[in-house]
């Protein structure tokens, strides 16, 4: 026994109290308008297709259609009793894209096409997306339209992010094979590109691929190995999209940042996060070579986006993604450091000579704060009990620091009898002194280390 469908609607005249399926008339195998329930809600009948008459004696509309009388009033038992006929109209009025790659004016037309397809023993047509095929859903009031600010940034900056590939020669055949790849970003319309120095390390041919797939041979214009910044150049006719450098000194902890790179041809990789730690002040941003602070972020920086830009929500570059990771933390070279490098590079090329020598010991470090110390202590049980000093992220091989015995994860707490509270203190002493007698906290030991800075070309 079937209970009648649509019990809340007024009963049509002459409907039985109970539905009896045996009394339902046989139905054709295929219905043009799809199936529907009869006026009593007892039997499945062929519904009228879109545009067909409904109400009165014509019967119900098919699936997804409603019976609308002139002036757009939906038909009801009351209307039917007044003996007014309506038309079957699709309840959904927006276009849809079908799996057959056709755009349908509405869902009902797609369903009708699907029924025709099945009748011909072809696959049914299903809905792939709202809106026309090949066209995005552009509803300005949708949440994804309003709140996808990260995607907006990526869309804005992606054309200026490039894929860099390095080639080496085989020793005897001299055939070139790809050896490594990374990312970079365009900083001038005529083709200057910034990347990590480690991306374009020596003895390699460098090829750059733009977002549009165009490839160019690049020339290495300038490299600061210690700061891990390189400037390369491609020859391109016409103007290239560029990224502007923001002020890393104005970054605030908690700011949203986006790390973008181009690890494969024509493809970007995007990670996002916040700034965990910024430099401790404008003065520390002028640090010499690699003895400098980094921007720390929880945006994942990996081989895919190394050399690419770390940007703020305005699409300004606030750092270069660099690979060095300590205790699950990612680092970026601050944009103020990039500006300095670009300015000095410009001067060097304009004057055709090197500027004054710099003193260098060969460490990458960051200022230790109590919160940073706590974070590192949580990650490493044996991290020293210190709340300030210069935390060594990396000791560069074959440098005075390595020769003197400095190690990764050491914390410099004093030099030449003066306490060290930040990375800036270390850089200041390096500039002034020819010998550095350091006290370093390693685990829970204090170790005396002597480092002799070397003079290098900038």
């Amino acid at each position: 026994q079937l209970s009648r469908a649509g019990r809340s609607a007024p009963l049509a005249a002459g409907c039985p109290d109970r539905c009896e399926p045996a009394r339902c008339p046989p139905q054709p195998e295929h219905c043009e308008g799809g199936r529907a329930r009869d006026a009593c809600g007892c039997c499945e009948v062929c519904g009228a297709p879109e545009g067909a008459a409904c109400g009165l004696q014509e019967g119900p509309c098919g699936e997804g259609l409603q019976c609308v009388v002139p002036f757009g009033v939906p038909a009801s038992a009351t209307v039917r009793r007044r003996a007014q006929a309506g038309l079957c109209v699709c309840a959904s009025s927006e276009p849809v894209c079908g799996s057959d790659a056709n755009t349908y004016a509405n869902l009902c037309q797609l369903r009708a096409a699907s029924r025709r397809s099945e009748r011909l023993h072809r696959p049914p047509v299903i809905v792939l997306q709202r809106g026309a095929c090949g066209q995005g859903q552009e509803d300005p009031n949708s949440l994804r339209h309003k709140y996808n600010f990260i995607a907006d940034v990526v869309e804005k900056i992606a054309p200026a992010v490039v894929h860099i590939e390095l080639f080496r020669k085989l020793p005897f055949s001299k055939r070139e094979v790809p050896v490594a790849s990374g990312s970079g970003f365009i900083v001038s319309e005529d083709g200057l590109i910034v990347t990590n120095a480690h991306v374009v390390t020596n003895k390699h041919r460098v090829k750059v691929e733009l977002k549009n797939g165009a490839t160019y041979e690049a020339k290495i214009k300038d490299v600061d190995e210690k700061a891990d910044i390189a400037l390369i150049k491609i020859d391109h006719q016409g103007k290239l999209p560029v990224l502007l450098l923001g002020r890393s000194s104005e970054l605030r902890p908690g700011e949203f940042v986006v790390a973008i790179g181009s690890p494969f041809s024509l493809q970007n990789t995007v990670t996002t996060g916040i700034v965990s730690t910024t430099q401790r002040g404008g003065k520390e941003l002028g640090l010499r070579n690699s003895d400098m602070d980094y921007i720390q972020t929880d945006a994942i920086i990996n081989y895919g986006n190394s050399g690419g830009p770390l940007v703020n929500l305005d699409g300004e570059v606030i750092g270069i993604n660099t690979l060095k990771v300590t205790a699950g933390i990612s680092f970026a070279i601050p944009s103020d450091k990039i500006k300095k490098f670009l300015t000095e590079s410009h001067d060097r090329q304009a004057k055709g000579k090197a500027i004054t020598k710099k003193k260098y010991i060969g460490i990458r470090m960051m200022s230790l704060t109590s919160s940073k110390a706590k974070e590192l202590k949580d990650r490493h049980r044996d991290f020293p009990d210190v709340i300030s000093g210069a935390y060594i992220i990396e000791v560069i091989p074959d440098t005075p620091a390595e020769a003197g015995g400095l190690k990764e994860n050491d914390v410099i707490i004093s030099i030449n009898g003066q306490s060290v509270v930040s990375a800036n203190d270390v850089s200041d002493v390096i500039k002034r002194e020819s010998t550095l007698n350091m006290v370093v906290r390693r685990g829970n030991e204090d170790i005396m280390i002597t480092v002799i800075p070397e003079e290098i070309d900038p």
């Epitope: 085989l170 020793p171 005897f172 055939r175 094979v177 390390t201 020596n202 003895k203 074959d398």
Partner: antibody, heavy 123, light 105 residues
């Protein structure tokens, strides 16, 4: 992981030829040259020659020129070294070894080696 | 051809000792490479580009030098370090030193 697997030991008569195979796996075979190095009992390692598997281009140590032939089958990721006109002093362990490359310095070395194939030349 | 002279040809040392092997070449080379070979086994790369430690190699091994004179050092000899050590250069083509056989006293 990178592996180089060589064919088994051989005993040959003076004047004969020997062909040793080296099956590579775990990397793109055509991106690295394959080299052959031999070691006679109690002697230093001695470079014999190399092949670029992509092009078939070869380079040989002058000492073996005319007697050694190095070939490669790209489809099988296998390199071969054939040494002809064998003499007793060719009794040695023959190694295939992949040319390694230093990204930082641009230098070349041998980073992966086969297990070695002992070739004994005896009448 | 570049001639390579490795010395000593053999040496005996105690566990914990600092061991040094030298390699001289007849004309200047950019880099030196060092290998360890245990009996019946293929050589294993220890040091590349003169001073860089190959992947998975203990830090007690180190290399230094430039031009024509290069040094390989084991800072604290361990029993498993018993082997023959070879230097190798690669200028026009690769050549190896004659080897240094290291034994435990």
């Amino acid at each position: 992981q990178v592996q180089l697997v060589q064919s088994g030991a051989e005993v040959k008569k003076p004047g004969a030829s020997v062909k040793v195979s080296c099956k590579a796996s775990g990397y793109t075979f055509t991106d690295y040259e394959m080299h052959w190095v031999r070691q006679a009992p109690g002697q230093r390692l001695e470079w014999m020659g190399a092949i670029d598997p992509e092009t078939g281009g070869t380079a040989y140590n002058q000492k073996f020129k005319g007697r050694v032939t190095i070939t490669a089958d790209k489809s099988a990721s296998t390199a071969y070294m054939e040494l002809s006109s064998l003499r007793s002093e060719d009794t040695a362990v023959y190694y295939c070894t992949r040319e390694g490359y230093s990204y930082e310095g641009g230098g070349y070395y041998f980073d992966y080696w086969g297990q070695g194939t002992l070739v004994t030349v005896s009448s | 051809d570049i001639q390579m002279t490795q010395s000593p040809s053999s040496l005996s040392a105690s566990v914990g000792d600092r061991v040094t092997i030298t390699c001289s070449v007849s004309s200047s080379v950019s880099y030196m490479y060092w290998y360890q070979q245990k009996p019946g086994k293929a050589p294993k790369l220890l040091i590349y580009d003169t001073s860089n430690l190959a992947s998975g190699v203990p830090s007690r091994f180190s290399g230094s030098g430039s031009g024509t004179d290069f040094t390989f050092t084991i800072s604290s000899l361990q029993p498993e370090d018993i082997a023959t050590y070879y230097c190798q250069q690669w200028s026009t083509y690769p050549t190896f030193g004659q080897g240094t056989k290291l034994e435990i006293k």
